[in-house]
């Protein structure tokens, strides 16, 4: 039985410090947890956005959480990879990215995660309903494919800021929080000099100098988060798929890169072809709740079922389990 | 009230595919997650595939034992999905359940929040 659980980000306590037999007495039976109710599940995360800054710009990204190591990732869109889908882009860890049009740009984000930036064909709308699938071919658990689209809220038209990375939510908490206790404070103060003063209090006019004063405080910090944390990533215009498009392709095998379909701005010239697009190296990329997930452990290469021509230079990484949403 | 209705069950032979479809319809505004289980014959109902949304993002976790021969995927109006079945063997006959609910916090098991569950389809794999 597959089950999920969340927690939160965890870092080792620091030694000697007051209480850390405590803390990791705390966090073990966590650990424990989320090691026991994750393990065997794959879970693939894909996300959609249409910027606000532009109509009808589109950004996917897709991220795999499990135990196994990514041997390949296709992206897809009109439907699974399998069924109808058209694909955009293929990325492998050694032989690079390959990508067709209306895909501009496709790369690694984290080692198991990629993003994908459609361009466009001069369609002055998007397609609301366009589905995007992302294929992860992963060792030793097999081939996960999930699809994403865009929201039904989603509004090309509103002049709302794009949504924040999902990270943001704690830090905007914490911020918002601060700033509300803020101007609860300047209020309270007002009420303190009021009642001090014997005469009545002169107007300071606080619903027009007061409130907004604090408000406009709280504001700024989180836009200035929303822009120090928010992932960028280029905007652009994409169509409706477009019937020129070539139809999805099988990859696997020797020639994996010779047989997926050839595009006139993209015709192979064996692997050298192929943009060497480096992945990320490991780092400490630990993030909370939508697809994100804490990266550690080390194993040795391995080659995927199907893909024996293509071992794995990274390694897979250790358990990563998916957090629950909302 | 959430009313379900599966839809593409059948006979197919082994190594064959189907699609399921599983609509839903009525108060399906707080809807976040669907997903599609299966009781063999003689066995338990296991967990096969779910589907969450939250915002932009879409979120699908698929039973281990799988290998990666089925997919599970939604329409963006949140109100229907679709489970492809490749290569199918025996061992995956059953009736299929779609279940849907809302998740508002941690899901510690895979019906976590499923409240509404539809009548079943039968997939029968047979040569």
């Known amino acids: 039985m597959r089950t999920e659980a969340q927690v939160p980000a965890l870092q080792p306590p620091e030694p000697g410090l007051e209480g850390a037999m405590g803390h990791r007495t705390l966090v073990l039976p966590w650990v424990l947890l989320t090691l026991c109710v994750t393990a065997g599940t794959p879970e693939v995360w894909v996300q959609v956005r249409m910027e606000a800054t532009e109509l009808s710009s589109f950004t996917i990204r897709c991220g795999f959480l499990g135990s196994g190591s990514i041997s390949l990732v296709t992206v897809s869109w009109g439907g699974p990879n399998g069924a109808g889908g058209t694909t955009l882009a293929v990325l492998h860890p050694e032989r690079g990215i390959r990508q067709w049009a209306p895909a501009r740009q496709a790369r690694w984000e984290t080692q198991s995660s990629i993003s994908l930036i459609l361009e466009g064909s001069g369609a002055s709308s998007p397609c609301a309903n366009t589905t995007f699938c992302c294929k992860f071919a992963s060792f030793p658990e097999g081939s996960w494919e999930a699809c994403g689209s865009l929201p039904p809220s989603s509004d090309p038209g509103l002049s709302a800021p794009p949504t924040p990375a999902p990270i943001l939510r704690a830090d905007l908490a914490g911020i918002l929080g601060v700033s509300g206790v803020l101007l609860f404070g300047c209020v309270y103060l007002l009420h303190l000099l009021r009642r001090h003063k014997h005469r009545p209090a002169p107007r300071l006019q606080p619903s027009r100098t007061s409130p907004q004063a604090p408000r406009a405080r709280a504001w700024a910090p989180s836009q200035a988060s929303q822009a120090a944390l928010h992932v960028p990533y280029a905007t652009i215009n994409t169509s409706c798929r477009p019937a020129t498009l070539d139809t999805a392709h099988p990859h696997g095998g020797p020639s994996w890169w010779a047989s997926l379909p050839t595009h006139a701005a993209h015709r192979p010239q064996g692997p050298a072809a192929w943009a060497s697009t480096p992945i990320p190296a490991r780092g400490s990329f630990v993030s909370v709740e939508n697809g994100l997930y804490a990266q550690a452990g080390e194993r040795p290469p391995h080659t995927g079922p199907g893909l024996t021509l293509f071992p794995d230079p990274r390694g897979p990484r250790a358990m990563e389990g998916p957090l629950g949403v909302r | 009230q959430v009313q379900l209705v599966e839809s593409g069950g059948g006979l197919v032979q082994p190594g064959g595919s189907l699609r399921l479809s599983c609509a839903a319809s009525?108060?399906?505004?707080?809807?976040?997650?669907m997903g599609w289980f299966r009781r063999a014959p003689g066995k338990e109902r296991e967990f096969v595939a779910r589907?969450?949304?939250?915002?932009?993002?879409?979120?699908?976790a698929y039973a281990d034992f799988l290998k990666g021969r089925f997919t599970l995927y939604g329409a963006v109006a949140r109100n229907r999905v679709y489970l492809q079945m490749n290569s199918l063997q025996p061992e995956d006959t059953a009736v299929y359940y779609c279940?849907?609910?809302?998740?508002?916090?941690?899901?510690?098991?895979?019906?976590?929040?499923?409240?509404?569950w539809g009548k079943g389809t039968l997939v029968t794999v047979s040569s």
């Open positions: 009525g108060r399906t505004d707080s809807m976040n997650v």
């Open positions: 279940a849907a609910g809302e998740v508002s916090g941690s899901s510690y098991s895979p019906d976590y929040g499923m409240h509404y």
């Open positions: 589907i969450k949304w939250n915002g932009d993002t879409t979120y699908t």
